[in-house]
């Protein structure tokens, strides 16, 4: 027999199948050109000394063989004696060490058996009613296919599934979607309605994330406010990355979990924009304001659960940066200006009412005045900070007020509102004899002392009513007692106390009269 033809004789070996586990398998035969055909198969087991024979039986019952030696692939033409227009049955017999091993048979019409391609190019992945839907363009001239998929997770081996018959320019498949683990999918195709025809190769891996992106397990820390009025937000723990199946390791588009940082600036509610989402890789610098920060995990199916943290306001206060002058027309604040064309947000809130919404005002963009100061004024009628109580004032600045991450803290301080001069006057001034020539003066703390940094000092004034001589004694803001010495017995004195702020001289308390009794010696 000629090597290019199928030999219609008995093969040169005994016919018995040894039935061993090794041997030829996965035979597939298909047309590769208008008149050319190919059969290929796998051989399991030691290959030394193995000879392969491709067997073919025609519908008439006549059988022939091709001897391929050690090769597991054979090409032949439609002139090789094998009928290509009618159904034939093919199998492989492999002869080695005086025994024959036989593959499963395939029965097909060779002319119609076209080698199908797997899904090529872009396989679109979407979610449909809790299942995974894959869709792709049908390869050219290959409409009408059976499609299978196989899938695995990081901890499981391949499982086979069926996509059903396809008969359109686009093909699709519904597959199981895992809730919490990533999956790798591959697809293969064969001609519809020809069970004996061979499957295509498996497609490239399609990597699919779990339906639920993982809950981000992270912790934040925030640094001290810098001189520029901003503090760095840092991640103490990175989010854990998803475990991936073998074929999805390395750059596998589609399976990525991305983490976003959602900032919500709670302070300064009158600003243009309160929230901003940004990549977790670009951890922002924040002003000293209070924030809520959420980490949102997302994959190709959308966002997953998030975790939210509260970042409290920076409570560090500036002792003297703010100057407040109260005039007949109203009140003006002055503070060291930032760059030109800066927008300021002035926020105030009565101390002790931190839960309630702060009042705030946004200035128009302003340049520094000749003294390098920025200002904000309001009239008495507006009622702003009009009550006689302690207010916490924070001033924020931004050259881009719509950009949440560019706000910075200019200062944070306290201010006593209303008529601080009168409201701050110390009450309950009392005088007690201390020694033969001294007294102890006590008073109740000024209301100003409830306002951190506002009370600069107390001043105690003592007037000798005989000579009208006056002495004044400064007292630390933390003290509410002073000893007056070098007093003369029998002389009437009046004592008064006032409380001063950095920018305001307080009103004197009601005069308190006293005298030291003359000591009569026995």
């Amino acid at each position: 027999c000629r090597t290019s033809e199928c030999c219609f004789q008995d093969p040169p070996y005994s016919d018995a199948d040894s039935g061993s586990a090794s041997g030829p398998r996965d035979l597939s035969c298909y047309r590769i050109s208008s008149a050319g055909y190919e059969c290929s198969w796998q051989y399991e087991g030691p290959t030394a000394g193995v000879s392969h024979f491709l067997r073919c039986c025609l519908s008439s019952g006549r059988c022939c063989y091709f001897a391929t030696g050690s090769a597991t692939r054979l090409q032949f033409s439609d002139q090789a004696g094998v009928s290509v227009l009618h159904t034939v049955t093919l199998w492989v017999e492999s002869w080695a060490r005086n025994r024959t091993e036989k593959s499963p048979e395939v029965t097909l019409q060779l002319y119609k058996s076209v080698k199908y391609k797997p899904p090529l190019g872009d396989i679109k992945v979407s979610k449909l009613a809790g299942q995974l839907r894959m869709e792709w363009e049908t390869p050219d001239n290959q409409v009408g296919a059976e499609v299978q998929f196989r899938h695995r997770t990081p901890s499981s081996s391949w499982k086979l599934g069926d996509c059903g018959p396809q008969d359109d320019d686009t093909e699709s498949c519904l597959c199981p979607l895992e809730m919490n683990v990533a999956q790798e999918f591959q697809l293969r195709r064969r001609r519809l309605g020809s069970q004996g025809s061979s499957w295509s190769k498996w497609s490239s891996p399609v990597c699919v994330p779990p339906e639920n992106p993982p809950q981000p397990q992270v912790r934040f820390s925030v640094e001290q406010l810098g001189r520029d009025g901003r503090r760095r937000l840092t991640l103490k723990e990175q989010p854990t990355q998803l475990e991936l199946p073998e074929g999805c390791q390395g750059p596998a588009p589609g399976v990525e979990v991305t983490y976003q940082l959602q900032l919500h600036m709670l302070s300064c509610p009158c600003k243009a924009k309160a929230t901003r989402t940004l990549p977790l890789e670009k951890m922002p610098y924040l002003s000293g304001a209070a924030y809520n920060v959420a980490v949102i995990s997302s994959n190709r199916f959308g966002p997953g659960p998030n975790q939210t943290w509260h970042i409290p306001a920076d409570t560090h206060t500036e002792p003297v940066a703010l100057n407040i002058s109260v005039g007949t027309n109203g009140t003006t604040m002055y503070w060291p200006a930032r760059a030109q064309s800066t927008t300021y947000c002035i926020e105030w809130q009565p101390v002790g009412q931190e839960g309630s919404l702060a009042t705030c005002n946004l200035t128009a963009p302003q340049d520094p005045d000749p003294a390098g100061m920025a200002t904000y004024s309001w009239s008495r009628e507006s009622g702003a900070m009009g009550q006689e109580k302690c207010y916490h004032i924070t001033i924020f600045a931004s050259a881009h007020p719509k950009k949440l991450t560019l706000w910075s803290t200019v200062l944070s301080t306290y201010h006593f509102g209303g008529n601080a001069s009168a409201a701050g006057t110390p009450h309950h001034v009392s005088v007690k004899n201390h020694s033969l020539d001294s007294v102890s003066v006590d008073w109740a703390p000024s209301l100003l002392s409830t306002c951190p940094g506002v009370l600069k000092e107390y001043v105690v004034r003592c007037r000798d009513e005989d000579s009208n001589q006056v002495s004044e004694h400064p007292v630390q803001p933390t003290e509410t007692q002073v000893t007056l010495s070098d007093l003369r017995a029998g002389v009437a004195y009046t004592v008064q106390v006032r409380a001063d702020t950095a920018w305001l001289r307080g009103a004197w308390s009601q005069p308190q009269r006293f005298s030291i009794k003359v000591q009569v010696s026995d």
Epitope: R230, P279, E281, K282, L406
Partner: antibody, heavy 117, light 110 residues
């Protein structure tokens, strides 16, 4: 006026080094994140590197990782790009750009780097 | 090969409207803000659109941006000869930890 001015470009042999500078004016440089972006002749924009306002976070494109180093000096209002082991494919116009929340709102006019033997 | 995909060129007559598409993935456009840049011949790029659809001051309202899923679109109405330029989309890619641009689209006003 807000302005960025690049300098330091020139002709260099393959394997050589160059240091690009970008001088910022008209804004508070220390508050802003910055980027370098390049454009090869007749080609599109290619992002090169990012540095945040206080130099605590830095990123590079894979094409320059290990060869280029971004840095800044806020006291001098300056951004830098140290380029080592230069290759023919690094020939481009190099721009520095100010970033505000993921968009580059101010660009310099660029400085030309030519790598050729 | 650019991470973001844009058509190489578009053209239209003066007064007409054009759109330029930019497609990416969930790790870039899908989860981050998109910007658009205009580069007139021989000049540096200029920010045209930020945060998907916001215009910087000085940019006419003939320019608009939108985003849907993993794609973004730049729209230009009332085309003028002065709009002839290269247009680039750009964003951050969270998987690459890198900035990314589209390959650019040359707009020709016929």
């Amino acid at each position: 006026e807000v302005q960025l001015v690049e300098s330091g470009g020139g002709l260099v042999q393959p394997g050589g080094s160059l240091r690009l500078s970008c001088a910022a004016s008209g804004f508070t440089f220390s508050s802003y994140d910055m980027n370098w972006v390049r454009q090869a002749p007749g080609k599109g924009l290619e992002w090169i590197s990012y540095i945040n306002s206080r130099s605590s976070t830095i990123y590079y494109a894979d094409s320059v990782k290990g060869r280029f180093t971004i840095s800044r000096d806020n006291a001098k209002n300056s951004l830098y790009l140290q380029m080592n082991s230069l290759r023919d494919e690094d020939t481009a116009l190099y721009y520095c750009a100010r970033e505000i929340e993921d968009s580059m709102d101010v660009w310099g006019q660029g400085t030309t780097v030519t790598v050729s033997s | 090969q650019s991470v973001l995909t844009q058509p190489p060129s578009v053209s239209a007559a003066p007064g007409q409207k054009v759109t330029i598409s930019c497609s990416g993935s969930s790790s870039n456009i899908g989860n981050n803000y998109v910007s658009w840049y205009q580069q007139l011949p021989g000049t540096a790029p200029k920010l045209l659109i930020y945060d998907n659809n916001e215009r910087p001051s000085g940019i006419p309202d003939r320019f608009s941006g939108s985003k849907s899923g993993t794609s973004a679109t730049l729209g230009i109405t009332g085309l003028q000869p002065g709009d002839e330029a290269d247009y680039y989309c750009g964003t951050w890619d969270s998987s690459l930890s890198a900035g990314v641009f589209g390959g650019g689209t040359k707009l020709t006003v016929l």
